[in-house]
């Protein structure tokens, strides 16, 4: 199809080489009020569309994305050629940063339902650059945490070093929905609830004498509880003796509950005490069996191919540790009688 009639938008993605970050493009199809099939209120009622409105369907997946090769080759269907780019409804997600993402991306409806729809498309010219060291030292991360129940703020990474007085107008989206009253370089949250968690996008306009473009950043916001003040507790084993049958295989499970920590480095291991000696046992990897906002339960098993007489003289110790402290639980094996 002819893309010369598409409306054009220029975007800049400046990514940090230090951290993983994502990027999104919205299919901003020109419409006076709402995108029929994206169900996203992106234009204010007073904003004038650049083209005639698109008479779209309500099918959320009814939009097609293409990339325009720089060599003039035909348009390429994003889904077929770019595994690191995912289409979700009307949004294109870039999972990994890199200058190779630079290029022209075109979106348009799959179903052409009226003569006006032929020109109903948007061409987004994306420029991707690594962040220079000249950027401010304490720029906000693309992953930000908000402490539940307290006040907090979400900063636009590309503007986090600017004061409120200097900051340009910022357009914010949360999970693809326009936040029309959030217009500054940070969203101030009076009290943090779990619904504040999500993917936030901040846009602002930069211009020179020739043209203007949108600078965009994506922020993953997580709502968290305060760091635990407690050391982990062992839920299993509870008893310090365990009846076993000699010659049979045995699995002893250690389950421990770790309170939430922003920097989480849990330790769970088994070691064996035999008279004056003790050594760590190489056992299968620990696995998380339950994770909630407040805590995580981690399990690690010790496996004996067959219980020997020697094992009855030993103590099997589960050791768990977080940044606050450690807890141990020892188990003595006892032969089953009768």
């Amino acid at each position: 199809f002819n893309i010369s009639g598409c409306s054009t938008k220029k975007l800049l993605w400046t990514y940090s080489t230090r951290s993983e970050e994502e990027f999104v493009l919205f299919c901003d199809l020109p419409e006076p009020q709402k995108s029929h099939f994206c169900h996203r209120n992106r234009l204010s009622p007073k904003q004038v569309p650049e083209h005639l409105p698109f008479m779209g369907s309500n099918d959320l997946s009814d939009v097609q994305w293409y990339q325009q090769p720089s060599n003039g080759d035909p348009l390429e269907d994003i889904r077929k050629s770019y595994p690191h780019i995912i289409q979700d409804k009307c949004t294109l997600h870039f999972l990994t940063p890199g200058v190779n993402n630079s290029g022209s991306y075109i979106c348009r409806p799959k179903m052409i339902k009226s003569p006006y729809d032929v020109a109903c498309c948007v061409k987004m010219i994306l420029e991707v650059k690594p962040q220079t060291n000249a950027s401010c030292e304490y720029s906000a991360s693309h992953k930000q945490d908000l402490l539940l129940g307290s006040t907090g703020s979400i900063s636009c990474p590309s503007l986090s070093c600017q004061s409120d007085a200097q900051s340009p107008a910022v357009t914010w989206y949360k999970n693809g929905k326009l936040l029309s009253v959030e217009r500054s370089n940070r969203i101030v949250v009076d009290e943090v609830y779990d619904y504040h968690q999500g993917t936030y996008v901040c846009d602002y306009t930069q211009s020179d004498t020739v043209s203007s473009w949108t600078v965009r950043a994506v922020v993953q916001v997580r709502t968290i509880v305060g760091d635990t003040k407690l050391k982990p507790d062992i839920l299993d084993p509870v008893e310090d003796t365990l009846e076993v049958e000699l010659g049979k295989p045995l699995t002893i499970s250690c389950k421990a509950r770790f309170g939430f920590e922003r920097v989480f480095n849990p330790v769970i291991k088994w070691y064996i005490k035999d008279s004056d000696l003790e050594w760590e046992v190489s056992v299968p990897e620990a696995k998380s069996i339950k994770s909630t906002l407040k805590d995580e339960i981690i399990e690690r098993n010790i496996i004996l191919e067959k219980v020997t007489q020697r094992d009855l003289r030993r103590k099997f110790v589960c050791f768990v540790q977080n940044s606050i402290g450690n807890t141990t639980q020892s188990v003595q094996l006892k032969e089953k009688r009768g």
Partner: antibody
Framework: SVEESGGRLVTPGTPLTLTCTVS????????MSWVRQAPGKGLEYIGI?????STYYANWAKGRFTIAKTSTTVDLKITSPTTEDTATYFC???????????WGPGTLVTVSL | AAVLTQTPSPVSAAVGGTVSISCQSS????????LSWFQQKPGQPPKLLIY???TLASGVPSRFKGSGSGTQFTLTISDVQCDDAATYYC???????????FGGGTEVVVK
């Protein structure tokens, strides 16, 4: 800086356009608000224009005013002035939908028969 | 529509003393903190003092303090100076922008 102009004596029903000229920053990057103040009275919020050109008006101002912009100016059109629209009109750079730190000196509009 | 009700005028203050002006919003301002305070002297445009309910604007003396959340807000001026004689306005931002409004103003007279 910000400066309003276009205020003058008009007769009721004669449309009037006030202009706010900005320098030192780009209207592509900032939101702007209009506020008015009748003689001896308090401040009244009229409305806002976003960097994108989207406009929002105070409930009482809808239909009575139109805000538009060019690359360096923001216009406020009083569609059909009445004597109650006699006031000094200010434009101001805006943060998070409220007037912020850069205000013009204001321009006086008098509506009289 | 939103209504912002301020302390009735005038309010008297002695030089060196403290004065407080209240601003009551109905309904709550957006995010409980989208409230600004302005100072205006005759023949001049308003000057921003406080935004986000309690953040001091650049260049404003720390004698000015904003507090409050939701529907009740206060501007406190400590160590009052003669230059503080002016009319003070609160302005509230709401989840529906068309509800944004100013309070009626409170005149502070310094003796």
């Amino acid at each position: 800086s910000v400066e309003e102009s276009g205020g003058r004596l008009v007769t009721p029903g004669t449309p009037l356009t006030l202009t706010c000229t900005v320098s030192g920053f780009s209207l592509n990057s900032y939101d702007m608000s209009w506020v008015r103040q009748a003689p001896g009275k308090g401040l009244e919020y009229i409305g806002i224009i976003y960097d994108s050109g989207s406009t929002y008006y105070a409930n009482w101002a809808k239909g009575r005013f139109t805000i538009a912009k060019t690359s360096t100016t923001v216009d406020l059109k009083i569609t059909s002035p009445t004597t109650e629209d006699t006031a000094t009109y200010f434009c101001a750079r805006t943060l998070n939908t409220l007037p912020f730190n850069i205000w013009g000196p204001g321009t006086l509009v008098t509506v009289s028969l | 529509a939103a209504v912002l009700t301020q302390t009735p005028s005038p309010v008297s203050a002695a030089v060196g003393g403290t004065v407080s002006i209240s601003c009551q919003s109905s309904p709550s301002v957006y995010n409980n903190n989208r409230l600004s305070w302005f100072q205006q002297k005759p023949g001049q445009p308003p000057k921003l003092l406080i935004y986000y309910a309690s953040t001091l604007a650049s260049g404003v003396p720390s004698r000015f303090k904003g507090s409050g959340s939701g529907t009740q807000f206060t501007l406190t001026i400590s160590d009052v100076q003669c230059d503080d004689a002016a009319t003070y306005y609160c302005a509230g931002g709401y989840s529906t922008i068309s509800d944004n409004a100013f309070g009626g103003g409170t005149e502070v007279v310094v003796k």
